[in-house]
């Protein structure tokens, strides 16, 4: 399908400031991480999927001198299909995931 | 609280391949967009929040020759607190949000 903007007459409602603020605050949020040779080695010639999603701290802090950093983290293990034509194998990999975040003073 | 990894004895379960794959596919997902002077003008000296979240296409495609692109989009309006000391004002801004995504051949 051709890229479609919404119909011009269709006026979306405005997202309220409190909702904008709440969603934007520093918190764990799902991010896409591309898989690299460092993570997955040199034997696999293709990985399916070639990226994964993990929870990482993101969003903004109320002051320029603060940054959003993890204060709780753990390793999460995931199954990845490793393809080395003509065979493939389900392997596992591990990535750091953030479970708690805080706005902390930026390191000088 | 100091940054805490999980207790060493606590072995998390492995995320199955189908779950990893489903979450990683090309789809609209929430991303954090920093607000800039270009977007908000030069009068406001501070914006609260200083970033917003919008739905944008992201994730990976099954082939290196494909990329995740929007096939449906719309403008979303949001309230932002614009501060110009000593006064402040609720303003509105508009950003593009993606509602549909597809893996399409990369442009040469």
């Amino acid at each position: 399908p051709v890229s479609q903007p919404d119909a011009p007459g269709h006026q979306r409602k405005v997202v309220s400031w409190i909702d904008v603020y709440t969603r934007a605050t520093c918190q764990p949020r799902e991010v896409v991480v591309p898989l690299t040779v460092e993570l997955m080695g040199t034997v696999a010639k293709q990985l399916v999927p070639s990226c994964v999603t993990v929870q990482r701290c993101g969003g903004c802090c109320p002051d320029d001198g603060l940054e959003c950093v993890p204060t709780g983290q753990h390793q999460v293990r995931m199954q990845i299909l490793m393809i080395r034509y003509p065979s493939s194998q389900l392997g596992e990999m591990s990535l750091e995931e953030h479970s708690q975040c805080e706005c902390r003073p930026k390191k000088k | 609280p100091v940054s805490q990894p999980d207790a060493p004895g606590h072995q998390r379960k492995v995320v199955s391949w189908i779950d990893v794959y489903t979450r990683a596919t090309c789809q609209p997902r929430e991303v954090v967009v920093p607000l800039t002077v270009e977007l908000m003008g030069t009068v406001a000296k501070q914006l609260v929040p200083s970033c917003v979240t919008v739905q944008r296409c992201g994730g990976c495609c099954p082939d290196d020759g494909l990329e995740c692109v929007p096939t449906g989009q719309h403008q979303v309006r949001m309230q932002i607190l614009m501060i110009r000391y000593p006064s402040s004002q609720l303003g509105e801004m508009s950003l593009e949000e993606h509602s549909q995504c597809e893996c399409r051949p990369k442009k040469k």
Partner: antibody
Framework: VQPQQPGAELVKPGASVKMSCKAS????????IGWVTQRPGQGLEWIGD????????NYNEKFKNRATLTVDTSSSTAYMLLSSLTSDDSAVYYC??????????WGQGTLVTVSA | DIVMTQSQKFMSSSVGDRVSVTCKAS??????VAWYQQKQGQSPRPLIY???SRCSGVPDRFTGSGFGTDFTLTISNVQSEDLAEYFC?????????FGAGAKLDLK
């Protein structure tokens, strides 16, 4: 499924040896064929592998200048040519059929003795 | 190159015992590890792949575990036919590399 290898080869120092490995047709065309060496009383060392369908190879850098892997698809046979032999090369050389990149099926091995 | 270290060169066990063979990779290899058994005068035989998946025909007294850099092959209820040398192998990155081996003998 076990690949077939000749039992032994006697070669002179400085010479070359070409070892063979015959596998069943279907397995041969759809698997990576690897070579692993084991010196007497020692551990195992991977030399390299070849995909008969394309002729694509991977080599252990340690053997890259002296080992050459080839295949004859018509006879479902893989070959390893090892050149400039010294007494250190006296060892058993296994032909292996790889599953992904672990060694699923091992030949009986060819014992190469380098001696004047 | 990734170095696979098997710290025990020799292990002694009685029939019916449980014995563990360990292997440490010099860098993270996820679950890309296999284990092999080699009896005197024979070719190696695969026991485990993907760190914990048992190869077909391998008795269930052989189990593999581990992730990242630390791996273990456990033989529960050791039998006399388990007298052999055990090797680990990583297939995360080229060149594929093996541990030096651990010999199991019976008391």
């Amino acid at each position: 499924v076990q690949p077939q290898q000749p039992g032994a080869e006697l070669v002179k120092p400085g010479a070359s040896v070409k070892m063979s490995c015959k596998a069943s047709g279907d397995t041969f065309t759809n698997s990576w064929i690897g070579w692993v060496t084991q010196r007497p009383g020692q551990g195992l060392e991977w030399i390299g592998d070849i995909f008969p369908g394309s002729g694509h190879t991977n080599y252990n850098e340690k053997f890259k200048n002296r080992a050459t892997l080839t295949v004859d698809t018509s006879s479902s046979t893989a070959y390893m040519l090892l050149s400039s032999l010294t007494s250190d090369d006296s060892a058993v050389y296994y032909c292996v059929i790889e599953n992904y990149a672990w060694f699923a099926y091992w030949g009986q091995g060819t014992l190469v003795t380098v001696s004047a | 190159d990734i170095v696979m270290t098997q710290s025990q060169k020799f292990m002694s066990s009685s029939v019916g015992d449980r014995v563990s063979v360990t292997c440490k990779a010099s860098q993270n290899v996820n679950t890309n590890v296999a284990w092999y058994q080699q009896k005197q005068g024979q070719s190696p035989r695969p026991l485990i792949y993907s760190a914990s998946s048992r190869c077909s025909g391998v008795p269930d007294r052989f189990t593999g575990s581990g992730f990242g850099t630390d791996f273990t092959l456990t033989i529960s209820n050791v039998q006399s036919e388990d007298l052999a040398e055990y090797f680990c192998q990583q297939y995360h990155s080229f060149p594929l590399t093996f541990g030096a081996g651990a010999k199991l003998d019976l008391k």
